[in-house]
């Protein structure tokens, strides 16, 4: 184009529908220039203008010839331009912030603007740039991009931004601009101009203030505090630690805390000091609620549900900032809130939820919430399967009869629809406990009753009870213990009876043992002893307990002695024993030795013995009648171990085995024995009966049974040369080769001749007895042989 013609044609659009084209006027033209602009398209259009720009509808794709004639005083000039969409710039209108507001409590800015989308023909993506500036010096704090879409109508956009610094601390400015990223436009796209700036500032009152106030934040966060002050701030501290000051506008200052530590329950103090004052705030650094742990719901009474949980990790937030809990049941929509006053027991929290009529399945969600967040736990529970009954109360025991009682107790709750499994603990004194399980139908009125049989009469029992539901969730706690004495019953057996003839053979002494408690069935008051023959029955006077012996003058005819035990309810079956023994001529006295504590007796099975066997024993040295104790064993037995606290080692006892037929006893075996053999306590007394030049005849006596302390097995006789009262070694001292020993195992032998001796020589003689329990002490003597003739 000629310099004297219009030149530098440029076109821009702000809405893709209209192009605003402008050019530079020819040099030297004044104000009074007219222009004719012709656009070569489908219809040749020309426009008459008085200015150097023209708004034309957007041209479709392709090249267009634009002719601009300039008509002025000294002639005209023409310029031709080729115009294409690609030469057009898309520059959106300068946006305008409709509203900028702030929530000072959360330090959040809220921005509102219009995208003027109604002027655009197509849907287009828009990129917005938002610029946040701080302080009067307008320091850039944040530049963010925000994407939206134009949709053919004016749309209001909202954007918010949380400031790291409380908004009270400094003035904040906001500007926006936009960029339309239209896919339908092939020209150059440019950013709009920045909008007019808007600002937010806090109007301080007369008091100096520190911000934020009483803020709750997450441990590990960064936080900025500031002090809005009219006087110079000299220092800032968090806790007892100083922090460097960041200067804001005027006297205002800030501090930035990085990675804040967990607070004490009273919070963390932040203070700013001036020459004469201190200004402060408190920050609470803690954690959001942990997911409630071990959420569990159960009922004690099918009236209300108790849900328990553990809060998990501590939040370090207390009081109004502590975690609040809400228990929501989703089927019913009902909920309950946890009151903070209900302080947790042993770190576990609990809530009660009233049960709903005809609802068995509950879907609970426990929501935990504090200023830093929320969490939840869920549990689905069939409450009839989660019954943890209360401890049974008012537990009582009443007699039914001597072997049965009635137990009653109270279990609060409405259990009409379920069954209970109850466990009754039955403890007899000095014996192990027994447990019985009973199934009981649940009731509405809380009172329960059960009968307990198969007990022993006149026995002290301790009862207690606990219950669970039949489906079993948890046992209740045990009820209180109740001690109860069952009533008496007649004794179930007659006393264990024995009889002995007196030493003069004129009287029969009847012995019996007290009945064990489980056979006495009550307190035995007395015994009846009667004596019957074919002709008559003679009853003795009643013998009061604790006498367990009676004496009757009897001839040597055979009588049946009956002993009956009586308690307050009645008499036992009689115990019968014949007065006379069944003779047995074929008896040898045997030797038996025990096993330290007792003695094992064995015998052959005898089918003739139909009632029982009796083993009787006594101390051999005691006078008649020989009776220390007796033991009855069943008729099918062939052995028994007799043990007694009265047995002593080294004491000889007599043992008698009797077999019983038709209440008559026959002596089957007679034994003497020791529980344990010991060595004799004395040496045999011995004398020299005869002496010659080459022999000595020695004679000795028996050792008394008491001093023998075992069965005599033999004698040891030692002899050798030796004199009384000399320093020569005694016979029994070791190392002497000339000492001779004779072991005499024939215990009936009472003499010994020692031959082949030297004449007129002193000999030392020693005699000792031995049992299987050891060798007894020695008895010694010195004898001088006669002179050879």
């Amino acid at each position: 184009q000629k310099k004297g013609a219009p030149h530098d044609l440029k076109c821009v659009t702000n809405n893709l529908q209209v192009w605003d084209c402008y050019w530079k006027a020819p040099s030297g033209t004044g104000r009074g220039t007219d222009y004719e602009v012709c656009i070569e398209n489908r219809s040749h259009s020309c426009y008459q203008l008085e200015k150097t720009n023209i708004k034309i509808p957007a041209l479709s794709h392709g090249d267009y010839e634009i002719t601009i004639n300039s008509l002025h005083d000294f002639g005209s000039s023409t310029s031709k331009f080729t115009l294409n969409e690609q030469n057009v710039s898309l520059i959106p209108d300068t946006p305008e912030i409709l509203n900028l507001s702030a929530d000072f409590s959360t330090s959040t800015l809220y921005l509102k603007w219009n995208d003027r989308g109604s002027v655009f023909p197509h849907h287009s993506n828009v990129i917005w740039e938002i610029k946040i500036l701080r302080k009067e010096s307008m320091e850039l704090v944040k530049l963010v991009t925000h994407n939206t879409t134009l949709n053919g109508k004016d749309t209001l956009h909202h954007w918010s931004w949380a400031s790291d610094m409380p908004l009270e601390c400094a003035i904040h400015f906001v500007e926006i601009r936009c960029y339309i990223d239209s896919l339908h436009f092939s020209g150059r796209k440019e950013w709009s101009d920045w909008s007019p700036v808007k600002n937010i500032s806090w109007m301080p009152d007369s008091q100096t203030k520190v911000f934020p106030q009483d803020k709750v934040i997450l441990v590990g966060s960064d936080i900025t505090f500031c002090c809005i002050s009219q006087e110079k701030v000299l220092s800032a501290l968090i806790g007892h630690t100083n922090c460097p000051l960041i200067h804001l506008d005027g006297e205002n200052v800030a501090i930035k805390i990085h990675n804040i530590s967990v607070s004490a329950s009273s919070g963390t103090n932040v203070v700013f000091t001036t020459e004469d004052n201190i200004f402060g705030t408190v920050i609470f650094a803690g954690y959001p609620p942990d997911t409630p742990q071990q959420l569990n719901c159960e009922t004690h009474d099918l009236k209300e549900i108790l849900c328990r949980w553990n809060p998990g990790r501590a939040t370090a937030l207390v009081g109004p900032r502590a975690t609040s809990y809400t228990l929501l049941e989703s089927f019913s929509g009902k909920y309950v809130r946890f009151k903070r006053a209900e302080a947790p027991t042993n770190g576990s929290y609990q809530l009660f939820f009233q049960m709903l009529p005809n609802q068995e399945i509950y879907n609970f969600t426990l929501n935990a919430h504090n200023p830093l967040g929320r969490s939840e736990s869920t549990i689905l529970v069939n409450i009839t399967e989660k019954v943890y009954p209360h401890t049974p109360t008012s537990f009582k025991v009443k007699d039914i009869n001597s072997t049965a009682v009635k137990l009653s107790w109270h279990l609060p709750g409405n259990f009409a629809k379920i069954n209970f499994l109850c466990q009754i603990e039955i403890k007899k004194s000095n014996t192990v406990q027994e447990q019985r399980n009973v199934t009981i139908k649940g009731v509405e009125n809380s009172s329960y009753l059960v009968a307990l049989d198969k007990l022993n009469p006149y026995t002290v029992y301790t009862f207690r009870i606990r219950c669970s539901t039949e489906t079993f969730w948890k046992w209740s706690k045990w009820s209180n213990k109740k001690q109860h004495l069952t009533t008496e019953a007649i004794p179930s057996k007659g006393p264990d009876t024995w009889r002995e003839w007196s030493s003069d053979g004129k009287n029969l002494i009847i012995y019996w043992k007290p009945l064990p408690i489980n056979e006495a069935n009550g307190k035995i008051l007395s015994y009846n002893v009667s004596c019957s023959s074919d002709e008559e029955t003679q009853s003795l006077s009643e013998i009061p307990d604790p006498q367990h012996k009676a004496e009757i003058q009897l001839d040597k005819n055979d009588y049946i002695i009956s002993v009956v035990a009586k308690n307050s309810v009645g008499s036992s079956p009689p115990s019968k024993i014949a007065s006379m023994e069944i003779p047995n001529d074929d008896l040898k006295i045997e030797q038996v030795v025990g096993m330290g504590k007792g003695i094992l007796l064995t015998w052959h099975y005898d089918p003739n013995m139909t009632c029982d066997y009796v083993i009787k024993w006594c101390n051999s040295s005691r006078s008649e009648p020989c009776l220390m104790d007796w033991r009855k064993v069943p008729s099918n037995s062939t052995e028994t171990v007799i043990e007694s606290d009265q047995f002593r080692p080294g004491v000889r006892y007599n043992f008698f085995l009797y077999g019983c037929r038709n209440q008559g006893y026959q002596l089957l075996r007679s034994m003497i024995g020791y529980i344990e053999e010991l060595a004799p306590t004395v040496a045999p007394n011995f004398t020299v009966e005869d002496t010659s030049a080459d022999s000595i005849l020695v004679k000795w006596e028996d050792i008394p049974v008491e001093e023998l302390r075992g069965f005599l097995r033999g004698y040891l006789f030692y002899f050798g040369k030796g004199e009384r009262d000399t320093s020569k070694m005694r016979v029994l001292e070791s190392g002497r080769s000339d000492i001779k020993v004779k072991n005499i195992t024939d215990i009936s032998q009472k003499t010994l001749r020692i031959a082949d001796l030297q004449g007129k020589t002193s000999y030392h003689l020693v005699l000792r007895a031995y049992t299987d329990g050891g060798v007894g002490p020695e008895k010694s003597m010195y004898v001088v042989t006669k002179e050879n003739s």
Partner: antibody, heavy 116, light 107 residues
Framework: QVQLVESGGGVVQPGRSLRLSCAAS????????MNWVRQAPGKGLEWVAV????????YYADSVKGRFTISRDNSKNTLYLQMNSLRAEDTAIYYC?????????WGRGTLVTVSS | DIQMTQSPSTLSASVGDRVTITCRAS??????LAWYQQKPGKAPNLLMY???NLESGVPSRFSGSGSGTEFTLTITSLQPDDFASYYC?????????FGGGTKVEIK
Amino acid sequence: QVQLVESGGGVVQPGRSLRLSCAASGFTFSSYGMNWVRQAPGKGLEWVAVIWFDGSIKYYADSVKGRFTISRDNSKNTLYLQMNSLRAEDTAIYYCARGQLVQDFWGRGTLVTVSS
Amino acid sequence: DIQMTQSPSTLSASVGDRVTITCRASQSISSWLAWYQQKPGKAPNLLMYKASNLESGVPSRFSGSGSGTEFTLTITSLQPDDFASYYCQQYKSNPLTFGGGTKVEIK
């Protein structure tokens, strides 16, 4: 653990000078204001001087103003008290204490006796 | 300067007693008050700051209250370890000032 150890005390004649030191360990010394507090025998506590964490500001009790100087060397984790023109009434145990406002840790003290 | 006055100067008490010490400021110090405990021959030990905040590691039987000019330190159940001297201190403005002290002794 936090430790403050005072040194430099002793017997000095009136009008003479003494320099007390306080060696700090177990914490970030440069993040705490530091104080000197003294206690005359059988008497209560008397605050003497404070220095800011960065040494920028210092304050003194009227009784020592112009005679005592508090200073610190953050690179050496050490606090100092330069005491000039000492008087009999300056006799006391001198404690070094951490904290610009509240003294949360104290040294065991060093005894200064001013006597002719 | 702000003057701090403590009362009583001496207090006789037995183990298990509830003990209260009072501190008055000559002008309002808001809550900017600390309490210290000192045992014979030892350095003071911080108990309480900002009138009622318990220092870490101090037993909960110690508590503080008050604001403005009237403050109290309370020991709910006196223990053998608590027989010592107690000082209050204001830190609202320099110079920092201490109370005259209260000696708690065994009755």
